[in-house]
């Protein structure tokens, strides 16, 4: 047994990473700003195995994945590239941002759309 | 900020309570036994507000709610009665056990059915 964290009060802690699900619907930029104001960033999937509980998260929430206009590739907020083994990206509508939608699937969306969002704080 | 727990390794910690989602499908009795073997019990909803993250959990998982044959009432594993403000119980098929199905809804099921399950360890 052991302690998890540290995390902001009432956040979820898993493998020393902190997560919070926010009900307010915001644009991607607003969601990013909200996470930053809480010393965190939008959700990043770095390992299906280590973040396995996320496969059961229902509905659609902004995550920290954006498309680079120059070459159309997708990258995380921290600048790292999206890897095929992190999640499946379903590109249907035109959009440069993405929502997380359970079972490690993400869906492209217009960044101006309003959605709930997930903030995350990686373990140091 | 603060630490959460203590919890078994790799469990989810929220408000000092510990949760784990198990992928193996078992009967209700087998699920209960699995949780007990890990010094925990099947999921109990005691407060929508304090367990708000559970509203986003998709799929259907055994929880610690059973029907008392004598009077048809529903109670938790710890013997306390189900309260209307804890969750909404949808009585679909005949069954004396219940699965948790997101948004604080539970669905009755035959206890011999196979389902995934959620174990929980209350904060001391």
């Amino acid at each position: 047994e052991g302690y998890c964290g540290p995390c902001p009060n009432n956040w979820i802690c898993h493998r020393n990473n902190c997560y919070q699900f926010f009900n307010e619907e915001k644009t991607w930029n607003q969601s990013q700003a909200s996470c930053l104001s809480q010393n965190s960033s939008l959700l990043k999937i770095y390992s299906k195995e280590e973040q396995d509980f996320l496969k059961l998260v229902k509905s659609y929430h902004w995550m920290g994945l954006v498309q680079i206009p120059a070459n159309g590739s997708w990258q995380w907020e921290d600048g790292s590239s999206l890897s095929y083994n992190q999640l499946t990206l379903v590109e249907i509508p035109k959009g440069s941002c993405a929502v997380y939608g359970s079972s490690f699937k993400a869906y492209t969306e217009d960044c101006a759309n309003l959605n709930t969002y997930i903030c995350m704080k990686r373990a140091v | 900020e603060g630490y959460c727990g203590p919890c078994p390794n790799n469990w989810i910690c929220h408000r000092n309570n510990c949760y784990q989602f198990f992928n193996e499908e078992k009967t209700w009795n087998q699920s209960q036994a699995s949780c007990l073997s890990q010094n925990s019990s099947l999921l109990k909803i005691y407060s929508k507000e304090e367990q708000d993250f559970l509203k986003l959990v998709k799929s259907y998982h055994w929880m610690g709610l059973v029907q008392i044959p004598a009077n048809g009432s529903w109670q938790w594993e710890d013997g306390s009665s189900l309260s209307y403000n804890q969750l909404t119980l949808v009585e679909i098929p005949k069954g004396s056990c219940a699965v948790y199905g997101s948004s604080f809804k539970a669905y009755t099921e035959d206890c011999a059915n196979l389902n995934t399950y959620i174990c929980m360890k209350r904060a001391v």
Epitope: Y60, V90, I92, P93, V99, G101, S103, K105, Y107 | -
Partner: antibody, heavy 117, light 107 residues
Framework: QVQLQQWGAGLLKPSETLSLTCAVY????????WSWIRQPPGKGLEWIGE???????NYNPSLKSRVTISVDTSKNQFSLKLSSVTAADTAVYYC???????????WGQGTLVTVSS | ELQMTQSPSSLSASVGDRVTITCRTS??????LNWYQQKPGQPPKLLIY???TRESGVPDRFSGSGSGTDFTLTISSLQPEDSATYYC?????????FGQGTKLEIK
């Protein structure tokens, strides 16, 4: 161009198990959920459930205790089994690609399943 | 489960008319609302997703609007081939649910 083709028994007796299969041709199989939806004669549409390539399933709680959806990734096929059928299960059953938030498209041609003694 | 209320259940209109069908949900679903057209003996066809985005190949006389709990499908100038039943569907929450349908007839 993704196309779905479905088949299975069209006439069942009460208490039997309905069994349908849907094959996916073209496009990505792994990137989506694959759904079953039914429509009783002259009535509306009811979502039954869905599965993805990894076997992850979501079911309608009203049918969950009788439904099994499975997948065969080697053939790009997914199947529906509905046990203990009654006359109330008489419907046209459709398979469809579930595009997450963006609706169901395309659809299979539909299979009329009649339950009668 | 999330309830979908569609109105009217049926309507009759003339070629060239502007037709509006509404869909109301029992709770907010953001813009995760899709519209389908179904003709007799055929599977439904996706017309609109994300409340207002036309599916590829759908004529621009079809448009969708709304967010939250109230949504509208509009056919700006009715054509004979638009005679069909129209369904709304929410993709916000499982189980996915459909409206009861609106049967549109051409006078």
């Amino acid at each position: 161009q993704v196309q779905l083709q479905q088949w299975g028994a069209g006439l069942l007796k009460p208490s039997e198990t309905l069994s349908l299969t849907c094959a996916v041709y073209g496009g990505s199989f792994s990137g989506y959920y694959w759904s079953w939806i039914r429509q009783p004669p002259g009535k509306g549409l009811e979502w039954i459930g869905e599965i993805d390539h990894s076997g992850s399933t979501n079911y309608n709680p009203s049918l969950k205790s009788r439904v099994t959806i499975s997948v065969d990734t080697s053939k790009n096929q997914f199947s529906l089994k509905l046990s203990s059928v009654t006359a109330a299960d008489t419907a046209v059953y459709y398979c469809a690609r579930a595009r997450g938030p963006w609706g169901f498209d395309p659809w299979g041609q539909g299979t009329l399943v009649t339950v009668s003694s | 489960e999330l309830q979908m209320t569609q109105s009217p259940s049926s309507l009759s209109a003339s070629v060239g008319d502007r037709v509006t069908i509404t869909c109301r949900t029992s709770q907010s679903i953001s813009s995760y609302l899709n519209w389908y057209q179904q003709k007799p003996g055929q599977p439904p066809k996706l017309l609109i997703y994300w409340a207002s985005t036309r599916e590829s190949g759908v004529p621009d006389r079809f448009s969708g609007s709304g967010s939250g709990t109230d949504f509208t499908l509009t056919i700006s100038s009715l054509q004979p081939e638009d005679s069909a039943t129209y369904y709304c569907q929410q993709s916000y929450d499982i189980p996915y649910t459909f409206g009861q349908g609106t049967k549109l007839e051409i006078k």
